[in-house]
């Protein structure tokens, strides 16, 4: 997909940071989404293995985020193929994970 | 060796402003969150504010009592982080102390780290 | 404004278990780190995120946490461990850090 600003990277990691910072508790009632490999995928495969979860205020303003850096509508199961070996894991860790990858790529210069 | 160093403390008149340093050493400081912390005389333990790593926003958010009269910055090319303080009273007065802040510890690259400086005087008195 | 709830003051003899409680409204979705002040010196942290240990603390320190209430445990209190002891966490925005009142921990000699 397109690559997206720098800006923007900036604030979906501050988003990132924002739901995660300090939590302890379950993030959308320990809803469990696909693990993605991340450095294969990207933006829409991230943006397809949240899209199952619903009903969860927390994470919509990521799942709009991750919308405007893809190029087409995502649909659930879309990018099954990138999951890893049919792992699910929940939603705060599947954030935190992203959110780490998502720095590296800045710190690297990716979105520069 | 890992470490803070404050400086900038003295005696200052309510009303009066003061600003103080924090040189950081011996981590990566770019990527850490920082707070500001104070104690009273013979009392508690004080938050004051914090700001996280640029990349991680660069936001800041302040205590009750300080919040408008207080600003915390960072210059991450200097490894040194700021705390101007305006509009001092009297309740001011206190050991103030920076510290790694340990909310943002799993963003930076210090989990379970933890450094604090010795601390620097502030006197409020007319 | 949050606040997080501490006893003052704390005794035990050497060797006993010490427990030191701190409770906060947010604390069931928040974690609770612990610090160690001695006279005249700066804090130690010494348990963060509810449980874990920093290298370097001494194994006989633990901590826990369940519902609104995070738990310092020191497991043979020793006189060195005279100190005042902070609890600190986050409101439930986890933007504004508190700390406890504190709490005096005697280790009567």
């Known amino acids: 997909g397109p690559v997206p600003p720098s800006t923007a990277l900036r604030e979906l990691i501050e988003e990132l940071v924002n739901i995660t910072q300090n939590q302890k508790a379950p993030l959308c009632n320990g809803s469990m989404v696909w693990s993605i490999n991340l450095t294969a995928g990207g933006f829409c495969v991230a943006l397809d293995s949240l899209t199952n979860v619903s009903g969860c205020s927390a994470i919509e303003k990521t799942q709009r985020m991750l919308s405007g850096f893809c190029p087409h509508k995502v649909s659930a199961g879309q990018f099954s193929s990138l999951h890893v070996r049919d792992t699910k894991i929940e939603v705060a860790q599947f954030v935190k994970d992203l959110l780490l990858h998502l720095k590296k790529l800045f710190r690297e210069g990716q979105f520069n | 060796e890992v470490q803070l160093v404050e400086s900038g403390g003295g005696l200052v008149k309510p009303g009066g402003s003061l600003r103080l340093s924090c040189a950081a050493s011996g981590f990566t400081f770019s990527n850490a969150w920082m707070s500001w912390v104070r104690q009273a005389p013979g009392k508690g333990l004080e938050w004051v504010g914090r700001i996280r790593s640029e990349i991680d926003g660069g936001t800041t958010n302040y205590a009750a009592p300080v919040k408008g009269r207080f600003t915390i910055s960072r210059d991450d090319s200097k490894n040194t982080l700021y705390l101007q303080m305006n509009s001092l009273r009297t309740e001011d007065t206190a050991v103030y102390y920076c510290?790694?802040?340990?909310?943002?510890?799993?963003?930076?690259?210090?989990?379970?780290?933890?450094?604090w400086g010795q601390g620097t005087t502030v006197t409020v008195s007319s | 404004s949050y606040e997080l709830t501490q006893p003052p003051s704390v005794s035990v003899s050497p060797g006993q278990t010490a427990r030191i409680t701190c409770s906060g409204d947010a604390l069931p979705e928040k974690y609770a780190y612990w610090y160690q002040q001695k006279s005249g010196q700066a804090p130690v942290l010494v348990i963060y995120?509810?449980?874990k240990r920093p290298s370097g603390i001494p194994e006989r320190f633990s901590g826990s946490s369940s519902g609104t209430m995070a738990t310092l445990t020191i497991s043979g209190a020793q006189v060195e461990d005279e100190a005042d002891y902070y609890c600190h966490s986050t409101d439930s925005s986890g933007n504004h850090g508190v700390f406890g009142g504190g709490t005096k921990l005697t280790v009567l000699g």
């Open positions: 995120e509810d449980s």
């Open positions: 510290a790694t802040d340990q909310v943002g510890a799993y963003y930076g690259d210090y989990y379970g780290m933890d450094v």
